[in-house]
Interface confidence: low
Amino acid sequence: MSVTDQAFVTLATNDIYCQGALVLGQSLRRHRLTRKLVVLITPQVSSLLRVILSKVFDEVIEVNLIDSADYIHLAFLKRPELGLTLTKLHCWTLTHYSKCVFLDADTLVLSNVDELFDRGEFSAAPDPGWPDCFNSGVFVFQPSLHTHKLLLQHAMEHGSFDGADQGLLNSFFRNWSTTDIHKHLPFIYNLSSNTMYTYSPAFKQFGSSAKVVHFLGSMKPWNYKYNPQSGSVLEQGSVSSSQHQAAFLHLWWTVYQNNVLPLYKSVQAGEARASPGHTLCRSDVGGPCADSASGVGEPCENSTPSAGVPCANSPLGSNQPAQGLPEPTQIVDETLSLPEGRRSEDMIACPETETPAVITCDPLSQPSPQPADFTETETILQPANKVESVSSEETFEPSQELPAEALRDPSLQDALEVDLAVSVSQISIEEKVKELSPEEERRKWEEGRIDYMGKDAFARIQEKLDRFLQ
């Protein structure tokens, strides 16, 4: 039975973080989801990814601090370094929900976590680095415009001791460490994947009970490359991951490969383009996409096809499968356990056969040997005597793998702000590096399209100012 006035909420600030949000969404869907799924996005999320997000999330809500109510705009102007934090605080405005659980886009849900909704505001798990503070990657909150205003006021007056949302929320909910123990979530609800646990007996004892894993630190799962044939995550340079982190990374990539990549091929040409009523690329703030005569928002087509992903010969809108490829096949797992009324096609990749796919669902000639669902990989983490084992009807059947051709279409690539390179032996996700002129940079800022996590990070701006002032 679904509970319509409660929701899991996440935030995706750009196309890269959307990959994490999609994995998180699909991992939640996999475990008897009974609540709504909501994703907050910022204006720079591309139109194509908005469409894909809408296949996984019940609500995709754009948050634009520049266009916001006066008091939000004022807070942003006063504390521009807290742009990302103020965006995250927007979750308190979701007042059509009585209670929500916020999960960062770099988390992965390993089992049903409905019991979190039994907790009150403000519930969170201790931070591994300083357990008297909570980690703000997973928390239970009650939407309220009053609380939202108080949080913004607090942000303006006090800033954040760590320059991010965690510092701000800890100073706002400052009694968390000393009051109600019920508001201390067990560590298994926000297990840091990359901490080399000093108390390793505890990890051995309790790590297998983990319900939510959090990929803290600068190396996110999408920063690694993945070999779908061996099912292994490829190490990046000097970065080496511990055995348990490798297992969690493998889980993340398994979900990505089986339940996120197929969504790209199910997006039809018209879907990324035609959205009556409001612009995909926010023409109302002079964005890069001109409105077409039909009043339909066009996706941004302002970059050349990425070198990493060669272009296909067939145009995006083609109704014919690419030559030499089999007809699109439908894969719908009838045994999939879904929330009341939800059709499995919403989550699993291939479009219905009467609507020809833009990207043909071409099974690779050599299916990958690795387990395609969680159950086998979870044995790395779960002891045999674990009570809550995942029942077979909850498991995604292996979905057909995404062929390398799938993402070669130039207009599909142009619509994304990321380079997705997919081959038989490697999948990688990289940020598109687009050199903008100073004028374009300034216009992006004026439009509120600020990359808080990347090149517009406060530290980088400070660096530039320091150089300028020297």
Partner: antibody, heavy 119, light 109 residues
Amino acid sequence: VVQLGESGGGLVKPGGSLRLSCAASGFTFSSYHMNWVRQSPEKGLEWVSYISSSGTYIDYADSVRGRFTISRDNAKNSLYLQMNILRPDDTAVYYCSGGYYSSSHMDVWGKGTTVTVSS
Amino acid sequence: EVVLTQSPGTLSLSPGERATLSCRASQSVSSNYLAWYQQKLGQAPRLLIYGASSRATGIPDRFSGSGSGTDFTLTISRLEAEDFAVYYCQQYGSSPRYTFGQGTKVEIR
């Protein structure tokens, strides 16, 4: 061309039933949250029922709860409203409308179909 | 239940003039969830503004929305002949999911 076309309206006696249909074309129906909204001179615009893009979530106005049933068939690009135990105050023009991505507003509307409940 | 009250009920203006329409909520509404629609006689409503201030596709820039909390405004900077219609504000909440204002009629003076 983006279009929603309602059908199934008509004259019905109090206590009777009607089934309204809404056919969508020109856009990806399965990505839209859909609603039925009605309009009468007495009550103005009044939201009746909502169904999420996948059909998972359904909601009704208190005035119709238990009497009306909303449903959708994404394969057929169609939205339906089954109206039972109709009352004179259900008399109105019924519109189907949809919202893309978010359900908070309605960016596409049909032309409406008239339902008259009278003895 | 959030009640939206629009004022004035009727606004009589000439083409080229500025129109300011008000929508007041009985309790605070998130600006993310406030929309404005235009309806001409015999036609369905048409979305103008969503999220209190974002213009929908194809809507001329003479239409703008503003406000937060309980007070929202739709402004038409220079009225054109096709702008004479009825305007409704709408909020999205929990129960009922949507509520509409009673409308403001903008008529030619």
